[in-house]
Interface confidence: low
Amino acid sequence: RAPRCRDLPVQKWWHTGALYRIGDLQGFQGNGAGNLAGLKGHLDYLSSLKVKGLVLGPIHKNQKDDVAGTDLLQIDPNFGSKEDFASLLQSAKKKSIRIILDLTPNYQGENSWFSTQVDTVATKVKDALEFWLQAGVDGFQVRDIENLKDASSFLAEWQNITKGFSEDRLLIAGTNSSDLQQILSLLESNKDLLLTSSYLSNSSFTGEHTKSLVTQYLNATGNRWCSWSLSQAGLLTSFLPAQLLRLYQLMLFTLPGTPVFSYGDEIGLEAAAVPGQPVEAPVMLWDESSFPFISAAGSANMTVKGQSEDPGSLLSLFRRLSDQRSKERSLLHGDFHALSSGPGFFSYIRHWDQNERFLVVLNFGDVGLSAGLQASDLPASASLPAKADLLLSTQPGRDEGSPLELERLKLEPHEGLLLRFPYVA
């Protein structure tokens, strides 16, 4: 008799794929535009990325550092009207893209939560949650919560409002902290909270260190649903050595949890991070006309248009990974097991019941390596076969679909492999 199938876990929409942050409408749209009506025109692009949610804004009225002049129920006229927003919600729904609204109050000012009048601000947030839930928003984000006094209790309260309206609504909190204890204390009192932090960017970017960061986090959070990013708002290129960009895309898409990206991550967009100054939003490079004041000769390989036409580009890799992440059970909600690995690399298995299994091998080193994968730590339900088929490599030139011997895997510097193998009873 065939073994009984494992019961499927409850899957919320944010469990099924990546979230995409557009914190700056002007930067994202470029060409001097930057409003909700214009954003509607880019929903097809977001669909092509197979992202499940768009984290938008903040777009509310905020007079810099002025509590009275901050209205979380009003859209800043520079971005458009409530009608424009309703129209965006409707169009996004048709394309199965959920809208998450950033309500970080004082986003134009010095302290995101104002330095005083915490209770007044918290009440404004409560009112805003109720208002925008009625308007059809799918979730909310609040950032810089390390600046919010009694953050845990406020988050619990806001979570109750959100979940009370519908279990299908999401609350994301962002912090600049990379400290695991601080992160855990925020998560402790908030069961379904999705938390973005700088945890992964506090790294020496070796295979060994990354493995220990990931496994510590997963062990500490238990069966709680995680999110994976390198920061609460910035671009991957601001935190990573450039040569590890593809490797991290592969990792973020294949760890158990929701990957969260910022606009431009899919093409390797860069933005200067200047000490002591707010990061100015970079302009999204749609095509060569996005370079308004310099000659853009040879720049196509940096743009969405140029990368869309190149199967070996970062954007093409992003799309392939996002597609796999949203349809394979083992990647959607499978168990995670890290394999024994050397200092240069990190590898793990994702598996769910009798579905196809996935093996991820990441070489963080700047030298090629031969990896003999050790399955010693694996439970019987996740044993390694002798060979697995190569689904994709982060580097061009591999023969995809071909079986690779796991005892004798050779990886190029900074190469990541995604391999698949069947369940065997």
């Epitope: 290129t237 450039a242 860069e270 933005a271 200067a272 000490p275 100015e280 302009v283 308004p292």
Partner: nanobody, 125 residues
């Protein structure tokens, strides 16, 4: 404050090569987009090329594409302009510049915050 100093200019025959350096002090430039510009006598300053923060992306004006190469060594806080197959029309004062707000000179805000004093390049026929 960022202080930029160019060096490596000089007199060279047409077809020859030069390597200009731009050494920065006062702050690390690894998070700045860096650009090279030039100004020929009696002409406006013109864009030559730019390099992104990490050095992974470069852009050049059409007239130098394929002949000039910009690179950077963030550990040494220095940016380079390698110039090959030089032509008399490349004669100019060459300036390097730092954009502290952007990783490339590509955003609509544009503009560089810090400039060097320039180094003279003369190409004789």
């Amino acid at each position: 404050q960022v202080h930029l100093v160019e060096s490596g200019g000089g007199l060279v025959q047409a077809g020859g090569s030069l390597r200009l350096s731009c050494a920065a002090s006062g702050r690390t430039i690894s998070t700045y987009g860096m650009g090279w510009f030039r100004q020929a006598p009696g002409k406006e300053r013109e864009f030559v090329g730019t390099i992104s923060c990490s050095g992974t992306s470069t852009y050049y004006t059409d007239s130098v594409k394929g002949r000039f190469t910009i690179s950077r060594d963030n550990a040494k806080n220095t940016v380079y302009l390698e110039m090959n197959s030089l032509k008399p029309e490349d004669t100019a004062v060459y300036f390097c510049a730092a954009d502290t707000r952007h990783c490339m000179g590509y955003t609509k805000h544009g503009g560089y915050d810090y400039w060097g004093q320039g180094t003279q390049v003369t190409v004789s026929s």
